[in-house]
Interface confidence: low
Amino acid sequence: GVSFFFLSFHISNLQFNSSLEDPSTDYYQELQRDISEMFLQIYKQGGFLGLSNIKFRPGSVVVQLTLAFREGTINVHDVETQFNQYKTEAASRYNLTISDVSVSDVPFPFSAQS
């Protein structure tokens, strides 16, 4: 089975603009690519399956996404802890200043899809 987690965080050193509402723009695609790459670095262990549903919202830039892991390999607390530990590295590697991290379980039945 697969476990899903909803993650939200702020990137306080970026400005939201209308191009982040349009997945065809360079800004949207570059930010999406860099965030995807970042998460592959954070959750390197075998249980990480990927992420989906990246959305950008106003408020500097608010990022919302869903993370997928093999069932039983990680819990909400560890997802949040690992992400918070990575914030310094995110600043250096990806020029992203991250704050206001929030993680929650994606409730059944979505998590039952595997």
Epitope: L14, E30, L31, D34, Q85, T88, E89, A91, S92, R93, Y94, N95, L96
Partner: antibody
Framework: EVQLVQSGAEVKKPGASVKVSCKAS????????IEWVRQAPGQGLEWMGE????????NYNEKFKGRVTFTADTSTNTVYMELSSLRSEDTAVYYC????????????????WGQGTTVTVSS | DIVMTQSPDSLAVSLGERATINCRAS??????????IHWYQQKPGQPPKLLIY???NLETGVPDRFSGSGSRTDFTLTISSLQAEDVAVYYC?????????FGGGTKVEIK
Amino acid sequence: EVQLVQSGAEVKKPGASVKVSCKASGYRFIPYWIEWVRQAPGQGLEWMGEILPGTGRTNYNEKFKGRVTFTADTSTNTVYMELSSLRSEDTAVYYCARYGDDTSGGYYAVDYWGQGTTVTVSS
Amino acid sequence: DIVMTQSPDSLAVSLGERATINCRASESVNILGTNLIHWYQQKPGQPPKLLIYHASNLETGVPDRFSGSGSRTDFTLTISSLQAEDVAVYYCLQSRKIPWTFGGGTKVEIK
């Protein structure tokens, strides 16, 4: 003052291993990557990989994977680079360097370097 | 891997004249508007010294005759008025993707 002080020169035989140390001082050791770069005689610079001392996370250049190991001792603020199965082409000066930021955290770059450790591989 | 092609291999310039070194990346080194390219100066027997970070920012304490420019794949280091102490080898470095890669170096001499 940020300083990286490396261990002394080494002479090794082919097939042996070498372990070079890099002691950091003058800054918070844990959150900054330490890079390892080597330079063969008369040649350019080559990135070997890096370690984040606080977590032990490492990234290696595939060219050296399996032969090089980075470790960190946070009690002594020291990083180690061990290279095994040495061959003559490994004769080089090995540098450690800090991937650091300015005081405002406004940029990151390899800003401070150790003095270099000469490793000679010869039978 | 990102290949950094530096040119020329060597450069002889008269004192007080301009020296220009180029570095071309095999793919973009830009990330969210920041170009992750850095320039270093190395003198014999010494470790490299950071001159320019993020393509165009002058490191603290570096003389302002050094400047960097460029974006995405093409970058330039300029010494506006060469001084005797600038004789050295200059390297570009990309830190956009692992493995980080250096240019092959440019040796700057006095003509």
